[in-house]
């Protein structure tokens, strides 16, 4: 099980209307450029076999991947939203830096790896899809971690 006190984000992180709106606007703009509507990255398969107490740890992994492998490489696109949303998400990632899991997290890593593989397989369109799902990432992170 996770060290649950560390796998928490204060509700106030998600109660900032401006940055919430910018995150959703960024997702909307990117989703307009997403041609592949059949694939969903953040959905049931990602959370398959993951207990309630492990969800935040899983979302931390997804957040870190999204920042490092998607948002940083695409940081010049979708302005002005990107320059505001990326630092916000990076702060959330930093606040979850002490969120770890005790024991076996293989099932979580397996699920996250499938998401990573899907993004990589789709190439740049996979990165655009991930940005287009930032609203789902934001909401899933909130629901899992508060």
């Amino acid at each position: 099980a996770p060290i649950s006190s560390h796998c928490r984000l204060d509700k106030s992180n998600f109660q900032q209307p401006y940055i919430t709106n910018r995150t959703f606007m960024l997702a909307k703009e990117a989703s307009l450029a997403d041609n592949n509507t059949d694939v969903r990255l953040i959905g049931e398969k990602l959370f398959h076999g993951v207990s309630m107490s492990e969800r935040c740890y899983l979302m931390k992994q997804v957040l870190n991947f999204t920042l490092e492998e998607v948002l940083f490489p695409q940081s010049d696109r979708f302005q002005p939203y990107m320059q505001e949303v990326v630092p916000f998400l990076a702060r959330l990632s930093n606040r979850l830096s002490t969120c770890h899991i005790e024991g076996d997290d293989l099932h979580i890593q397996r699920n996250v790896q499938k998401l990573k593989d899907t993004v990589k397989k789709l190439g740049e369109s996979g990165e655009i899809k991930a940005i287009g799902e930032l609203d789902l990432l934001f909401m899933s992170l909130r629901n899992a971690c508060i």
Epitope: A1, K11, F14, I42, G43, E44, F47, H48, G49, V50, S51, M52, S53, R55, D135, L136, M139, S140, R142, N143, A144, I146
Partner: antibody, heavy 119, light 112 residues
Framework: EVQLVESGGGLVQPGGSLRLSCAVS????????MIWVRQAPGKGLEWIGI???????YYASWAKGRFTISRDSSKNTVYLQMNSLRAEDTAVYYC?????????????WGQGTLVTVSS | AVVLTQSPSSLSASVGDRVTITCQAS??????LAWYQQKPGKAPKLLIY???TLASGVPSRFSGSGSGTDFTLTISSLQPEDFATYYC??????????????FGGGTKVEIK
Amino acid sequence: EVQLVESGGGLVQPGGSLRLSCAVSGFSLSSYAMIWVRQAPGKGLEWIGIIDIDGSTYYASWAKGRFTISRDSSKNTVYLQMNSLRAEDTAVYYCARDRFVGVDIFDPWGQGTLVTVSS
Amino acid sequence: AVVLTQSPSSLSASVGDRVTITCQASEDIYTNLAWYQQKPGKAPKLLIYWASTLASGVPSRFSGSGSGTDFTLTISSLQPEDFATYYCQACVYGDSADSRYTFGGGTKVEIK
């Protein structure tokens, strides 16, 4: 095919106990949480409680103490133990699978089993 | 605990009509709202989640919208099989788990 079948309902006297069963097929209880919801005659839906993948249970405040959810993974069955039953517990009781997609959604549902509490 | 208020509690409509049902939450629930359809003597069936995402196999005449406290379920052209009761349902995280899942009171759609 995913299926949920409730059983164990019937007529019970006030103060009595009853154990409902929800037999599932097409998926594993080690991969999904399960919820119980009830519906009094002509009324709306009311959440009772949930049993998570790891066996943790959570209950609506009104259900704590009288209602207990458990499971037997080897039988792929979830149970709802109801004690100290009252007339107002008369309802159709449903089990449903909790699919977390970033938010909890309940799909599919069993057909329900009717519990009548009366003397 | 969040309270979901559905309106109207019942409505009469004809086949082909556009039907709109609203669900108001007593506090901000973001997009943590689902809609279910229940026919007499049957179990509820998931229609919409994330406030606006259509569940698998649900006809495109159903749509959902809203966020925060105000939500809408729309049936663009009512079909004979759509006469049923519709429930909204919210998930509230971060507070006590004993009030995490809440249902609205329901809206019965009847034949005019």
